[in-house]
Interface confidence: low
């Protein structure tokens, strides 16, 4: 039968030929009568056989990682007979491993993200190298991992390639780390081959920083003319964290005056100081408020970083604005009796400069010929007033600062002219009456009424009478109707046109004023030649003729 041992050939042998082993038939007595033959893939090219001895040689450098075993067939022939001595048989040549492959990291590039401040031992990532050498052959493919760069923050488990945190890291100091891992085969023993890989480890942010004001004191100014809601300035805190962890809210911590407010601009993370109530320089020219800032989102477990909110002091200076004069009242109403003499006192208006410099005030009246005002605000008349011409005056009084004539204020002043009984009652219209020559006694000639230009305090009451002369010798009489009218009646029968064509009657009208005023009003009565029906048309004609200068017979 065949005699052979297990065949091994080391890979990567540089010698021209390497003796692998010997194939032999136990029938071979060494007299060179047997011929050995090698068949199969690799026979003659990779392996050759000494036909006489059966010695096998490798004539090529082998690479186990390319091919780890060769299956060949062996024949042995008796050269004297040409017949096979043994049946053809299959045998195996194994390529034995040498450590000719370094470990390789196949999943590069490695990148990992881990939260900053993670505790020691936190798993970051596992890196794995592979070694093409034979894992079953000694330690050629047994790897050990070590850290070349990344201390003291990271460590690597030697056998697994698991990278862990070995020291807490602060993203705000450094946000990414390049860790270099070395894998060595032969479990690190002499002759080991190594490969390295880089791992980019990025720290994700946690909210471990509270916002802190950039300044301990901010100085802002606000004009006293600023309306409520005005933004008077911004304050800013900085937070070393990023993203949502850096979002902050500003608020007022202290403002006794409750004059200001702070709103947060979430785009810029600034605090905007807002005027909540109007300020007045003359009342208070500076304010001090305290503001605080906190993160918008804080996890419960990170509260230890946010115990004391950062605060800042804000000094707000009120800027003085030259304000126009301020009248004591929004308007004034004065009264003055009519007919008072020119220069009479009407009233006093008063305006002051609200600013600290207290400029003297000059007063003026817009377009008035009736009133005057002096620098003390005293209004007087320049003419005597007649209520019956104007009972009210609507004046515009202007106050101007002496030191800044552009600072002007105006207010309305109403002057009421009070009535005095300075007008006697008089006929309400012109009366011209007619009496017929044949008129009888007691005939009504005319009803008269009166008017009084004075204002009635209660109600006008007029008293009608004939003058003393007319009462004694009058052809007419008067009856007061007690309703501010009176009737004129004939006091005799018959009148003569030729002898007395016209009567002029003096009628006294008195009012009920204090003192009472009386006027004398003349009533003209024409005597007419009337027809039987009492028509005075002839009279009218005659009168017309008379008035035109014609005489009628």
């Amino acid at each position: 039968g065949w005699v052979w041992n297990q065949f091994f050939v080391p890979e990567e042998m540089n010698t021209t030929s390497h003796h692998v082993g010997r194939l032999r038939s136990d029938l071979d007595n060494g007299n060179n009568s047997f011929q050995y033959k090698l068949l199969g893939a690799g026979a003659g090219s990779t392996f050759i056989i000494d036909e006489r001895t059966g010695d096998i040689y490798a004539i090529e450098k082998l690479d186990r990682e390319e091919r780890s075993l060769y299956i060949l067939r062996a024949q042995v022939i008796d050269i004297t007979t040409g017949r096979a001595v043994e049946p053809e048989s299959e045998f195996v040549i194994k390529v034995s491993d040498i450590n000719d492959n370094e470990p390789k990291f196949l999943d590069e590039p490695y990148e990992a993200i881990v939260p900053e401040m993670s505790p020691e031992g936190t798993l970051v990532i596992q890196v794995t190298a592979s070694d093409a050498d034979d894992p079953s052959s000694g330690n050629n493919a047994r790897l050990l991992y070590s850290l070349l760069q990344g201390q003291p923050y990271f460590s690597v488990e030697p056998t697994t390639g698991v990278i862990r945190i070995s020291s807490k890291m602060d993203r705000e100091l450094q946000d990414e780390y390049w860790v270099i891992i070395q894998a060595k085969d032969m479990i690190g023993q002499p002759g080991a081959l190594s490969g390295t890989t880089s791992v980019l480890i990025k720290l994700s942010d946690v909210n471990d920083n509270k916002p802190i004001f950039k300044e301990s004191l901010y100085r802002l100014t606000v004009s006293e003319s600023a309306p409520t809601g005005t933004s008077i300035g911004t304050i800013m805190a900085y937070d070393n964290d990023i993203g949502e962890n850096a979002e902050m809210d500003y608020s007022i911590e202290e403002d006794d005056s409750q004059t200001f407010d702070i709103i947060t601009n979430h785009e810029t993370q600034e605090g905007i100081v807002i005027l909540k109530k109007k300020v007045n320089f003359e009342h208070q020219n500076h304010y001090g408020i305290r503001a605080k800032v906190k993160n918008h989102h804080v996890d419960e477990q990170l509260m230890k970083y946010h115990t004391e909110a950062s605060t800042t002091f804000i000094k707000i200076q009120v800027e003085d604005v030259d304000e126009p004069p301020l009248f004591l009242l929004p308007y004034y109403i004065f009264e003055i009796f009519e007919e008072t003499p020119q220069g009479s006192f009407v009233g006093v208006v008063s305006a002051t400069d609200p600013d600290n410099r207290k400029s003297p005030i000059r007063y003026s009246i817009t377009r008035s010929k009736v009133f005057n005002i002096d620098d003390n605000g005293t209004i007087t008349t320049t003419n005597s007033l007649d209520r019956e011409i104007s009972a009210w005056y609507n004046l515009s009084i202007t106050a101007t600062e002496k030191y800044n004539i552009e600072q002007i204020s105006s207010i309305p002043v109403y002057v009421q002219v009070l009535n005095i009984n300075d007008h006697a009652p008089e006929f309400s219209q012109y009366y011209e009456s007619y009496v017929c020559e044949n008129a009888g006694s007691g005939q009504v000639i005319q009803t008269i009424s009166a008017v009084d230009r004075d204002e009635s305090i209660e109600e006008h009451h007029f008293y009608f009478n004939l003058s003393v002369e007319d009462t004694n010798s009058s052809s007419f009489t008067i009856i007061d109707n007690q309703d501010n009218t009176a009737v004129i009646l004939t006091n005799r029968t018959g009148f003569n046109l030729q002898e007395e064509p016209i009567f002029y009657i003096s009628i006294l009208i008195a009012d009920n004023g204090i003192p009472s005023l009386t006027s004398t009003n003349t009533l003209t009565i024409h005597v007419c030649d009337c027809d039987d029906s009492g028509s005075t048309q002839t009279c009218q004609y005659q009168e017309l003729m008379l008035s035109m200068g014609f005489k009628t017979e």
Epitope: Y153, W178, I180, T196, L200
Partner: antibody, heavy 116, light 112 residues
Framework: QVQLQESGPGLVKPSETLSLTCTVS????????WSWIRQPPGKGLEWIGY???????NYNPSLKSRVTISLDTSKNQFSLKLSSVTAADTAVYYC??????????WGQGTLVTVSS | QSVLTQPPSVSGAPGQRVTISCTGS?????????VHWYQQLPGTAPKLLIH???NRPSGVPDRFSGSKSGTSASLAITGLQAEDEADYYC???????????FGGGTRLTVLG
């Protein structure tokens, strides 16, 4: 404040071994990497190698065959040995602490002259 | 020959602005490793000036600033002062060498 102080002979004969020690004060040697760096007269800086507090080392490939760096945590010291020295090894030798990827604390340096 | 390339020298008058460049390759700065800058005053040990490309340690004036782009970085010094006269080194990590590397250094001379 961490301070580093190099010590060792200022003169070494050619072919002998240069030995230096760096004493760390103001902080523990356990936690960081510690490096040796040298500077030949009038020339630039050259990193020699480092030792991690766990004891693992890494050396400049150009000096690897001659360099040994060791650690004595009990004394808070680490040492450099450079064998088979020649005149080209004459330099100021600095010890330094590695912080991440840079050297944040340095010793003041010690001049070692290689001469017979 | 240094792995990171710096100009040997730069100069400027007091008050002026100067920049120092540091050029690397795809195995160091280009891979994403940070660049750090050191100032070495005559006869003293190097002192960390900028770390992580642009961060100033406390005590370093804001006249010093750093930036990084692609495979290079630069250090800018504004308002130059006489006490800024020193050697400046850039430093990074090189993955192909598995170690830290320095630039050759740049001597800054303040004129006048």
């Amino acid at each position: 404040q961490v301070q580093l102080q190099e010590s060792g002979p200022g003169l070494v004969k050619p072919s002998e071994t240069l030995s230096l020690t760096c004493t760390v004060s103001g902080g523990s040697i356990s936690s960081y990497s510690w490096s040796w760096i040298r500077q030949p007269p009038g020339k630039g800086l050259e990193w020699i190698g480092y030792i991690y507090y766990s004891g693992s080392t890494n050396y400049n490939p150009s000096l690897k065959s001659r360099v040994t760096i060791s650690l004595d945590t009990s004394k808070n010291q680490f040492s450099l040995k450079l064998s088979s020295v020649t005149a080209a090894d004459t330099a100021v030798y600095y010890c330094a602490r590695n912080w991440a990827f840079h050297f944040d604390y340095w010793g003041q340096g010690t001049l070692v002259t290689v001469s017979s | 020959q240094s792995v990171l390339t710096q100009p040997p020298s730069v100069s400027g008058a007091p008050g002026q602005r100067v920049t120092i460049s540091c050029t690397g390759s795809s195995s160091n700065i280009g891979t994403g490793y940070d660049v750090h800058w050191y100032q070495q005053l005559p006869g003293t040990a190097p002192k960390l000036l900028i770390h992580g490309n642009s961060n100033r340690p406390s005590g370093v004036p804001d006249r010093f600033s750093g930036s990084k782009s692609g495979t290079s970085a630069s250090l800018a010094i504004t308002g130059l002062q006489a006490e800024d006269e020193a050697d400046y080194y850039c430093q990074s990590y090189d993955s192909s060498l598995s170690g830290w590397v320095f630039g050759g250094g740049t001597r800054l001379t303040v004129l006048g």
